[in-house]
C-alpha cells in the first residue's frame, strides 16, 4: 500500500548489481538537500533476485522480465508513487558478461537489451543497463566504503558511531571478491603505480587521490573453482578426481562440456576420454591450497613487485575492508572477528575441510548442498589469495576487516557507482564540479 | 635513513635506553625492528613496532626490554641488561606492517657493552 | 615460532663459480622470505625480498627461488666482493620472531 503521508524532502535511487551468480537490486535514500554532503546516502532495502546471474540467460531471453520483476515491484512498494518518476535506476553487469562478451559481443548485447526494454516498462527513469570494467568496479567499491566509513570529510556524519577505528582520515583498501572477479583497490603509500592501467586518480571533496586498482577476471571464487577442476582433471589418471577441497565422503559429477563452458578455463582445455567425472572429496586444506596456488602464476613480473600473472602490485599500505563473498564466506566459517589471527583461521579452515560431508550437512542441515559443498574451497581460496595472491602476511592480515554492512548499507561497488553517476560526489568541498564518469573507463 | 645511538658499556643491572633517530620518512608509514649482533655471532630479532604502534617482541626479550615511538624516534629500552647483552645493536625499517617485504634501510650499528 | 635453519654453517667456493644456500622455515611462510649480506664490521644489506624479487642496486648474479618452506639464494659468477655472510629472514609473521633469521652461511671466495 501507497504511503499518503506528506512526502519527505527525500531522493531515491535504484541500482541493481547483475552478478556472474545472481542479481541484487539495491534501493537508497537521502536528504534532498544535502545532496552533495558525504555520508548522507544510506541503502533502504536490498532485493535479492530468484534465479543465476543474468549471463545465464543468454539462450532464455524471454525469460528475463520475469526474473526481474519480483525485486522491481518491491522497488514499486518501497519508494511513493510520488516520487517514482524521478527516481533513477542503473543496471551495473560485472565478469560474468565481461566473460560472456568475451565469448559473444553479440550474445551479450542480446541479454542487455532484452534487460534494459524490461527494465523501462517500470515508472522509474530508466538510466540504462552496461557492463561496467573491472577498473570501475574495483574503483566504486573503494569509494563506497570509505564514503560510508567518513573518509571523504571532517564534517559531522549523519550515523554517530564509525565503525573500524575510523578517527584518522587514511582511507580503507577495498578487498572485493565475486563468483567471476575479485578487486584489489588502495591508496599505496609514495608508491608510483608503475602500470598506467592500474592507475586512478581523481579529486573528491577538495582532496586528491592516486589510487591502484585491479580486477582478476577469472578469479572470483566460482571461476578459480573451475580453474582448479579443469588444472586438476589434466593429470587425473580416470574419471575419478579425488581433490582435496572436498570433504571426505563428498562425490559429484562434473560434465566435461560444462568445465570448459567458460573462457576461464580455456588454457586448461584437453581432450579427455571422457564426457564425464566424478569429484570424490578427500578433505585436506594443505593440499587444496597447494592445489590452488597453481592457479597464481607468481614466476614472471615485469615490475618491481607483482601479485601474479605479472600484474603490478605496490606495497600494501593500512586498513582493508573485505567485503562480498570474501565477508560471506568467512561469516559462514565464523572467522570474521577481528580477534581471529590468519594462524588460528589457517588452523580453522583444515579442521572444518577435514570433517566428513555427512557430518557437516547434519551441522548445517539448512544450508543448500551446492553451496555448503563449496565452503571448504571458497575459505581455503580465501587465504591462498589474500596471502600468497596479494602478499599479506600473518602481521597485515590484522588490518583487514571483513566487513558485510557498514552502517546498514552493503559495502560494494553499486552505491559507490550511483553517488558517481547522479553526481554526489562533488570535486571539491562543498560543492563543486562532480567526479566525471570518464575517470574510470 | 636510520641511525642508532645510546650504545655505550653499562654495568650488569644498570638500564639503558637505545634510540632509532628516522629521517626522510614518516614511522606512522612503517615498521621499524630492532635486531642484535653478538661478536662472532649470527643476527638475532629482538622486537619491532609497526606503523599503528602495535609491539611484537622476541618470546626471551619479553619482560627484558620495552620498544617504543614519537614523531621520529624508536627507542629500545633494556631494563636489566646482563653480560649476554652485548652486542651490536641495529635497528632496520620494514614495510608498514612488519619486514614483509624485507629490511631494506639498517642503520650502522650501536655498540653495547655489558660488563662489571 | 617459525624457525629458520640454513645450510650449509660455511662454503668455500672460486672465483666465477656458483654457490647455493639453502633455509627451511619450519612452517609455510609463503613467499615471505628475504635474504641479506653483511660483510665483517658493516651492516646487513638486504638482497632478495619476497623469495625472488631483487632488492633495488643488486646485481643481477643473485637470485632467490622457492616457496612455502624451502627456500633458495643463488649467487653466480661469484666475484671476490661476495665474500660475507648470507642470512635469510621470515617476514611472514613478527608475532613468532624467536628465531626469525637463519643461522647464516659464510662465503668465502677462493
Known amino acids: 500500500t501507497q504511503n499518503k503521508a506528506l512526502p519527505e524532502n527525500v531522493k531515491y535511487g535504484i541500482v541493481l548489481d547483475a552478478g556472474s551468480s545472481h542479481t541484487s537490486l539495491y534501493i537508497y535514500k537521502w536528504p534532498a538537500e544535502k545532496e552533495n554532503d558525504t555520508g548522507v546516502v544510506h541503502q533502504v532495502e536490498e532485493c535479492r533476485v530468484k534465479g543465476p546471474g543474468i549471463s545465464k540467460f543468454v539462450q532464455k531471453v524471454n525469460e528475463i522480465g520475469i526474473y526481474l520483476t519480483d525485486c522491481m515491484e518491491r522497488a514499486r512498494e518501497v519508494i511513493p508513487r510520488s516520487q517514482h518518476q524521478e527516481t533513477p535506476v542503473y543496471l551495473g553487469a560485472t565478469a560474468g558478461m565481461r566473460l560472456l562478451r568475451m565469448e559473444s559481443e553479440e550474445l551479450a548485447d542480446r541479454v542487455l537489451d532484452v534487460v534494459e526494454r524490461s527494465l523501462s516498462n517500470y515508472p522509474f527513469d530508466f538510466q540504462g543497463a552496461r557492463i561496467i570494467t573491472g577498473q570501475e568496479e574495483g574503483a566504486y567499491g573503494w569509494i563506497t566504503i570509505n564514503y560510508l566509513l567518513g573518509k571523504f570529510s571532517q564534517k559531522t556524519r549523519w550515523f554517530s558511531i564509525v565503525p573500524y577505528e575510523t578517527n584518522n582520515q587514511e582511507t580503507f583498501g577495498a578487498l572485493d571478491l565475486g563468483g567471476a572477479s575479485t578487486q584489489v583497490t588502495f591508496v599505496p603509500q609514495n608508491q608510483t603505480i608503475e602500470s598506467p592501467d592500474n592507475a586512478l586518480q581523481f579529486r573528491l571533496y577538495g582532496k586528491d587521490y592516486n589510487v591502484y586498482t585491479h580486477s582478476f577476471l577469472c578469479y572470483g571464487k566460482d571461476q578459480a573453482l573451475w580453474q582448479k577442476l579443469a588444472k586438476d582433471i589434466q593429470v587425473a589418471s580416470n574419471e575419478i578426481l579425488r581433490d582435496p577441497c572436498f570433504h571426505p565422503g563428498y562425490k559429484k559429477v562434473v560434465n566435461v562440456s560444462d568445465l570448459y563452458k567458460t573462457p576461464c578455463t580455456k588454457r586448461f582445455e584437453m581432450t579427455l576420454p571422457f564426457q564425464q567425472f566424478e569429484i570424490q572429496g578427500i578433505g585436506n586444506y594443505q593440499q587444496c591450497h597447494q592445489s590452488i596456488l597453481e592457479l597464481f602464476n607468481t614466476s614472471y613480473c615485469p615490475y618491481s613487485q607483482c601479485a601474479f600473472n605479472g600484474i603490478f602490485l605496490p606495497p600494501l599500505q593500512g586498513d582493508f575492508g573485505a567485503f562480498s563473498a570474501f565477508y560471506f564466506v568467512m561469516k559462514f566459517l565464523n572467522l570474521t572477528s577481528e580477534k581471529v589471527s590468519q594462524e588460528k583461521v589457517t588452523e580453522m579452515m583444515k579442521k572444518f575441510c577435514a570433517q566428513p560431508w555427512e557430518e557437516i550437512k547434519t551441522s548445517y542441515a539448512g544450508v543448500k548442498e551446492k553451496y555448503l559443498s563449496e565452503y571448504c574451497f571458497s575459505g581455503t581460496y580465501i587465504l591462498s589469495l589474500l596471502l600468497q595472491g596479494y602478499h599479506f602476511t600473518a602481521d597485515s592480515w590484522e588490518h583487514i576487516h571483513f566487513i558485510g554492512k557498514i552502517q546498514g548499507s552493503d559495502a560494494g561497488w553499486t552505491l559507490g557507482y550511483m553517488l558517481n553517476l547522479t553526481n554526489m560526489i562533488p570535486a571539491e568541498q562543498p560543492l563543486s564540479t562532480p567526479l566525471s564518469h570518464s575517470t574510470y573507463v | 635513513s636510520v641511525e642508532e645511538s645510546g650504545g655505550r658499556l653499562v654495568t650488569p643491572g644498570t638500564p639503558l635506553t637505545l634510540t632509532c633517530t628516522v629521517s626522510g620518512f614518516s614511522l606512522s608509514s612503517y615498521a621499524i625492528s630492532w635486531v642484535r649482533q653478538a661478536p662472532g655471532k649470527g643476527l638475532e630479532y629482538i622486537a619491532i613496532i609497526n606503523s599503528y604502534g602495535t609491539t611484537y617482541y622476541a618470546s626471551w626479550a619479553k619482560g627484558r626490554v620495552t620498544i617504543s615511538k614519537t614523531s621520529s624516534t624508536v627507542d629500545l629500552k633494556i631494563s636489566s641488561p646482563t653480560t649476554e647483552d652485548t652486542a651490536t645493536y641495529f635497528c632496520?625499517?620494514?614495510?608498514?606492517?612488519?619486514?614483509?617485504?624485507?629490511?631494506?634501510?639498517w642503520g650502522p650499528g650501536t655498540l653495547v657493552t655489558v660488563s662489571s | 615460532a617459525y624457525d629458520m635453519t640454513q645450510t650449509p654453517a660455511s662454503v668455500e667456493v672460486a672465483v666465477g663459480g656458483t654457490v647455493t644456500i639453502k633455509c627451511q622455515a619450519s612452517q609455510n611462510i609463503y613467499s615471505n622470505l628475504a635474504w641479506y649480506q653483511q660483510k665483517p664490521g658493516q651492516r646487513p644489506k638486504l638482497l632478495i625480498y619476497r623469495a625472488s624479487s631483487l632488492a633495488s642496486g643488486v646485481p643481477s648474479r643473485f637470485s632467490g627461488s622457492g616457496s612455502g618452506t624451502e627456500f633458495t639464494l643463488t649467487i653466480s659468477g661469484v666475484q671476490c666482493d661476495d665474500a660475507a655472510t648470507y642470512y635469510c629472514q621470515q617476514g611472514f609473521s613478527s608475532n613468532n620472531v624467536d628465531n626469525t633469521f637463519g643461522g647464516g652461511t659464510e662465503v668465502v671466495v677462493k
Open positions: 632496520a625499517r620494514g614495510d608498514s606492517y612488519g619486514s614483509g617485504v624485507g629490511l631494506g634501510l
